[in-house]
Amino acid sequence: AILGRSETQECLFFNANWERDRTNQTGVEPCYGDKDKRRHCFATWKNISGSIEIVKQGCWLDDINCYDRTDCIEKKDSPEVYFCCCEGNMCNEKFSYFPEMEVTQPTSNPVTPKPP
């Protein structure tokens, strides 16, 4: 293991559509993947008139947007469905929303921006 990195082996699992999808509604999900790839946890939720409705929680595949994030925080401004990802076992138990200032996109096709 690399020093200072939280390896993710399991995440909190939740599925609001568990009946339709024929899954459990809630539990702990073991995260599978190639041994040399990073694994993460995620949470998705909706804010309906100030009421938080969790959509899904579970494991997320190797994603640079999630690297070295110990907390699950959505930073996008007012998305339709909120999404956050993090590293570390069960790091998706808690999630939060801290919108960043919207930066105007350049007119040319953007390339890899610096991660926040």
Epitope: W60, P79, V81, N109, T112
Partner: antibody, heavy 115, light 111 residues
Framework: QVQLVQSGAEVKKPGASVKVSCKAS????????INWVRQAPGQGLEWMGT????????SYAQKFQGRVTMTRDTSISTAYMELSRLRSDDTAVYYC????????WGQGTLVTVSS | QSALTQPASVSGSPGQSITISCTGT?????????VNWYQQHPGKAPKLMIR???KRESGVSNRFSGSKSGNTASLTISGLQAEDEADYYC???????????FGGGTKLTVL
Amino acid sequence: QVQLVQSGAEVKKPGASVKVSCKASGYTFTSSYINWVRQAPGQGLEWMGTINAVSGSTSYAQKFQGRVTMTRDTSISTAYMELSRLRSDDTAVYYCARGGWFDYWGQGTLVTVSS
Amino acid sequence: QSALTQPASVSGSPGQSITISCTGTSSDVGSFNYVNWYQQHPGKAPKLMIRGVSKRESGVSNRFSGSKSGNTASLTISGLQAEDEADYYCGTFAGGAYYGVFGGGTKLTVL
């Protein structure tokens, strides 16, 4: 094993729309992104956009903004790419690929735009 | 026009080593280790060979290696074999806050 299976070849007239599907299996569909890439005959790869399979959030290449729509149906582990107002230079093979690293690819769907 | 620049073609004899370059800018290739390399044989879908500059995908021969210096990423193939003849593309991670981009592709000919 991970598989992405795409819909069959399409022939469309200029001005029409096409919708290509990409059915995923062998992994949890809602655990990553699906990216879409196209390749015109004899040309290189061109990134079109991406969809977060769990949240449905999308990012499109500027070139396709306003003409492309990416959606997914999590109940059948399938992603879709719809391209509207087709022109002859949209003739290409369209690929879906899993995740931000494009680690698995569909077999490709040939879309021919011809009057 | 590609944001990443590759040579149109390279060639080598069996057993030789070749290197394909992929040049970007200080804000993409130069800043992050998020460049990947794909191999594409005629009529086939691309295949991920190297991700994150230098990590070989499982099942990929150790004859393939990736590196980076400044704003240029490189793919080196040692001990060239006939089956290595293909098109090779560099590309970036795409998803979330990151927009994808590919190089123009390099045709490798094994003489």
